[in-house]
Each structure stands twice: as structure tokens, then as C-alpha cells.
């Protein structure tokens, strides 16, 4: 294989759909990492802070989407309520295991080493409250106290 | 076809300044890294500086001999690249190519040079 | 950082030559051949230690071994005359430089 075909991925991070959250009570967030090649890579998922594996469903393996491009996709699902506080942090982690140091790269492009990249979102407010507002307000309430 | 053409080569005096151009066509400017080469009067071939695309945020690195005198800018929406030479020295004179390289090309099209003479 | 090449060498037409290019960095990073015949013109011989672009005749061949790079010519040919260069890179920021260049002269 030639190298100059390796690639990190573009990792993103879908917020949960309106009409799950009405529906279920559920709040699913979906997280893609795309164009990656070869598929060597780990997907985790962490909330706050800490790594989390409860309610979590990955794809059991990359999707080939042509010659020298994957994808993959994982799910977390958490409650309608945890989701909408702005409090809470989401984020989807894929480690990517390209070349090393000892690894010769041609010029022309930057050399895809072995990589975290990441993809975030902060829970939201059901009545469009940002996290910033919520902590202003907590405070508020907390000196009217 | 791919084309790369320098422009602006003149004579000039010890401690001015000048800035060469090079012009590209034929292929996604935006996708390559563009470097120049200076070959001085009956010397070999040396490297000047690079400016990597934006995805590398257009990061330029230079030559010792350069560094802090010579300058390397893109303009993407034109497809060019410019060398703007400042305490030009004697040794300077030379003529400037510019090429190209990517993620599976790899200074594979020079322009035909620009001569740069810097002479009292 | 210098990368070393012989300043001349000569070979008769249909002979085979190498010309060495050598630097301490050639392990970690690729090396590029180039030839500038007498109307100044560049042009990209060799690119990633061994790979030839579309076009350049299959006389042309490269390789590296260790701290050398070594471009090879088999069955030069009289339009072979001409200048190469090894290029390469070197360092954290991957500067570029260039070999000091070898003068190739084809005997008829």
C-alpha cells in the first residue's frame, strides 16, 4: 500500500433529535468519524470528564467507503434529562493509529501520526438556556439564597 | 496542464527590496504546499522557503540564509505566491524558481525562473 | 545539514552509473532526485527513494541504504548529460536541502 494514502478522520458529533426527546424521554447523541484510512482506530466515549461505556453503542466495525476511506459511527443514549442540562459535557474521542515517528513522510502534507481527535457538545437546555446563561443563573439564585 | 510562472526579477541595489511572483494554473492551488528555490550564478540548487495551505494555516519555514530578510505569502484566490526580498545582499543574486508539492505530487512542475540580481 | 554528492561523474553511453548522495537524515526522510540539463530546466526524476513519475524513462532508478541515497542510471543514454541533485529534508521543522549537485558527463 502506498502510505501517502493514510488518513486521520473528521470526527463529528450529532445532538440528540428533537422528536426522540419528545417521544422517549431518550436523548441519543451520534458521533462520526469519516475518511479515515487504514481503519485502525479506538472510539470512546466521555461525559464530564470521565470515560463512560453504559449506554453506548458502537459499530462492531468500520464501513468501508471506498478504496482508501472508512467510516464509523457510535451512539450514546442518555436520559431526555441529563441531556438538557448545560452542565453536562459530551464528548466523542477516536484515537487514530497512523504512522509513527520512525516512519518516513513525503513533503507536500502534514504527516498523520497516531492521534486523538475529538468531538464535543454541551448538554442543552430545553428552553434555550446555554451553559453560560445556566451558570449565571445558578450563581444568581445562589447569592438571592 | 500545469503551469508555474515567476514574474518580477530585476536589478537591484545591496540593502533594497524586491518581491518576485509566481503565478500557478492547471491545478488545485489550495491543495499544495508551494516552495521556492534559488540557483546562484554557476551554483547548485537551493532551498528558500516553504508556505503550507490552509489547512496548515499557511505556516511558512525558511532557510538560515534567509530567515528575517525574506518573506513568503499566498494569495489562494489568485493562485500565487509571492517572495518578498528585503536587505537583499550580493549574494542574493540568483535566479528564483517556485514548485510545488502535495499529497501525491512532489515537485513535480518548476516554473522556468525569475532572475534576481543584486549588484551596486 | 548538508547531503554530499561527488561533484562529477562520467559514464559511456550504454554503461551504467551511480551517483551517491549522502546525509545522516536519509533514514528518516525520503530523498528526491532531480536533473537540470544546460537550459536551467528542473526536473523530477525521482521522488520518495524509489518512485518514478510518468514519463521519466525506466533507465532511471533510485534506492537508500542506510545514510546513502543513490540515484543509478542504466544504460545512459548522450541527452543524460546533465546536473543532478538529491534533495531531502532534515530537522523539526523539515527544512529542505538540497545536495551539492553532480555533473554528469556521458562518453561516447
Known amino acids: 500500500e502506498d502510505l501517502r494514502n493514510v488518513t486521520p478522520p473528521k470526527v463529528s458529533l450529532f445532538e440528540p433529535s428533537k422528536a426522540e426527546i419528545a417521544n422517549k424521554q431518550k436523548a441519543t447523541l451520534v458521533c462520526l468519524a469519516r475518511g479515515f484510512f487504514p481503519d485502525h482506530v479506538e472510539l470512546s466515549w466521555w461525559v464530564n470528564g470521565k470515560e463512560v461505556h453504559s449506554g453506548v453503542s458502537t459499530d462492531p466495525q468500520a464501513y468501508k467507503e471506498s478504496n482508501y476511506s472508512y467510516c464509523l459511527s457510535s451512539r450514546l443514549r442518555v436520559s431526555a434529562t441529563f441531556w438538557h442540562n448545560p452542565r453536562n459535557h459530551f464528548r466523542c474521542q477516536v484515537q487514530f493509529h497512523g504512522l509513527s515517528e520512525e516512519d518516513k513522510w513525503p513533503e507536500g502534507s502534514p504527516k498523520p501520526v497516531t492521534q486523538n481527535i475529538s468531538a464535543e457538545a454541551w448538554g442543552r437546555a430545553d428552553c434555550g438556556i446555554t451553559s453560560a446563561s445556566y451558570q449565571q443563573g445558578v450563581l444568581s439564585a445562589t447569592i438571592l439564597y | 496542464e500545469v503551469y508555474l510562472v515567476e514574474s518580477g526579477g530585476d536589478l537591484v541595489q545591496p540593502g533594497s527590496s524586491l518581491k518576485v511572483s509566481c503565478a500557478a494554473s492547471?491545478?488545485?492551488?489550495?491543495?499544495?504546499?508551494m516552495y521556492w528555490v534559488r540557483q546562484a550564478p554557476g551554483k547548485g540548487l537551493e532551498w528558500v522557503g516553504r508556505?503550507?495551505?490552509?489547512?496548515?494555516?499557511?505556516?511558512?519555514e525558511y532557510a538560515d540564509s534567509v530567515r528575517g530578510r525574506f518573506t513568503i505569502s499566498r494569495d489562494d484566490s489568485r493562485n500565487s505566491i509571492y517572495l518578498q526580498m528585503n536587505r537583499l545582499r550580493v549574494d542574493d543574486t540568483a535566479i528564483y524558481y517556485c514548485t510545488r508539492a502535495g499529497r501525491f505530487d512532489h515537485f513535480d512542475y518548476w516554473g522556468q525562473g525569475t532572475m534576481v540580481t543584486v549588484s551596486s | 545539514y548538508e547531503l554530499i554528492q561527488p561533484s562529477s561523474a562520467s559514464v559511456t553511453v550504454g554503461e551504467t552509473v551511480k551517483i551517491t548522495c549522502s546525509g545522516d537524515?536519509?533514514?528518516?526522510?525520503?530523498a528526491y532526485w532531480f536533473q537540470q540539463k544546460s537550459d536551467k530546466n528542473i526536473l523530477l526524476l525521482i521522488y520518495m527513494d524509489n518512485k518514478r513519475p510518468s514519463g521519466i524513462p525506466e533507465r532511471f532508478s533510485g534506492s537508500t541504504s542506510g545514510t546513502t541515497a543513490t540515484l543509478t542510471i542504466s544504460g545512459a543514454q548522450p541527452e543524460d548529460e546533465a546536473a543532478y541533485y538529491c534533495l531531502s529534508s532534515y530537522g523539526d521543522n523539515n527544512d529542505l536541502v538540497f545536495g551539492s549537485g553532480t555533473q554528469l558527463t556521458v562518453l561516447r
Open positions: 508556505i503550507k495551505n490552509i489547512p496548515n494555516n499557511y505556516a511558512t
Open positions: 492547471g491545478f488545485t492551488f489550495s491543495d499544495f504546499w
Open positions: 537524515q536519509l533514514p528518516k526522510n525520503f
